[in-house]
């Protein structure tokens, strides 16, 4: 089954520094999102090979990309305290799949010793539940059912 490998699990950086997040898949995807989780999850970027990336206005001018959509490294520059959060990769494939998440802790330089990453990955409970099956729902009841495959009809 398709998976998204995401690294690092956690990183602590001072204000103004940069962070790299890598999202790797086995291929066969249409594109990849980086999303900041929270009460209202926010898309940060959408990246697709050969297409101008879509970037949230908050991060415009401070995001770089290297690699391809199958093995993408996203570099976020000039980090601010408000950028602290968990970021997860989402691959658009026949069944949408998610990375395990990267917890980015942005700290004021003098307090960096107080905030350290543990070795444990971010809690999976923060991520959306995967679909329970690929059967396509009846339109009358579909609002309560999981998504059909995102691109099953397309090559």
């Amino acid at each position: 089954a398709q998976e998204v490998q995401q690294s690092p699990h956690c990183t602590t950086v001072p204000v103004g520094a940069s962070v790299n997040i890598t999202c790797s898949t086995s291929g066969g995807l249409r594109g990849i999102y980086l999303r900041q989780l929270g009460p209202q999850p926010q898309d940060i970027i959408y990246y697709e090979d050969g297409v101008v990336p879509t970037t949230d206005r908050r991060f415009r001018g401070r995001i770089d990309f290297s690699g391809s959509q199958d093995n993408l490294t996203i570099t976020m520059h000039r980090l601010q305290l408000s950028d602290t959060g968990t970021y997860t990769c989402q691959a658009i494939t026949e069944v949408n799949v998610y990375g395990s998440g990267t917890l980015v802790l942005v700290t004021e330089e003098q307090s960096q010793g107080w905030h350290r990453c543990s070795d444990a990955p971010p809690r999976a409970s923060a991520l959306p539940a995967p679909p329970t099956g690929s059967a396509l729902p009846d339109p009358q009841t579909a609002s309560a059912l999981p998504d059909p495959p995102a691109a099953s009809a397309l090559p």
């Epitope: 249409r30 594109g31 926010q42 898309d43 697709e48 297409v51 879509t54 658009i92 609002s143």
Partner: nanobody, 114 residues
Framework: QVKLEESGGGLVQPGGSLRLSCVAS????????MGWYRQAPGKQRELVAD???????NYADPVKGRFVISRDNAKNTVYLQMNSLKPEDTAVYFC????????WGRGTQVTVSS
């Protein structure tokens, strides 16, 4: 939660054209990965066409060369221009944001018949 409302369906003769619209409420539509699905009576729902945030498009084989998907981010709207319609295109058409597992819209009925 994003809400979707489809419109533009109707009765059309074979060889005719229709333009479907889907308006999405909510923010960040420019990030939406939008698809048009259809479901004919007694058949499974199938993805007809999709369009990424970067405007790249894909089409299912039965509609290639006849249907065109497009988007207008300023209007939070995705369109499906359907040309050279055939009786087998008869179905209820739904739009969907492929990013999420949210609710479907009600769809819009397209009937191709002489």
């Amino acid at each position: 939660q994003v809400k979707l409302e489809e419109s533009g369906g109707g009765l059309v003769q074979p060889g005719g054209s229709l333009r479907l619209s889907c308006v999405a409420s909510g923010s960040s539509f420019h990030f939406a990965f939008m698809g048009w699905y259809r479901q004919a009576p007694g058949k499974q729902r199938e993805l007809v066409a999709d369009i990424s945030p970067g405007n790249s498009t894909n089409y299912a084989d039965p509609v290639k060369g006849r249907f065109v998907i497009s988007r207008d981010n300023a209007k939070n709207t995705v369109y499906l221009q359907m040309n050279s319609l055939k009786p087998e295109d008869t179905a209820v058409y739904f739009c969907r944001d492929l990013r999420s597992w949210g609710a479907w819209g009600r769809g819009t009925q397209v009937t191709v018949s002489s």
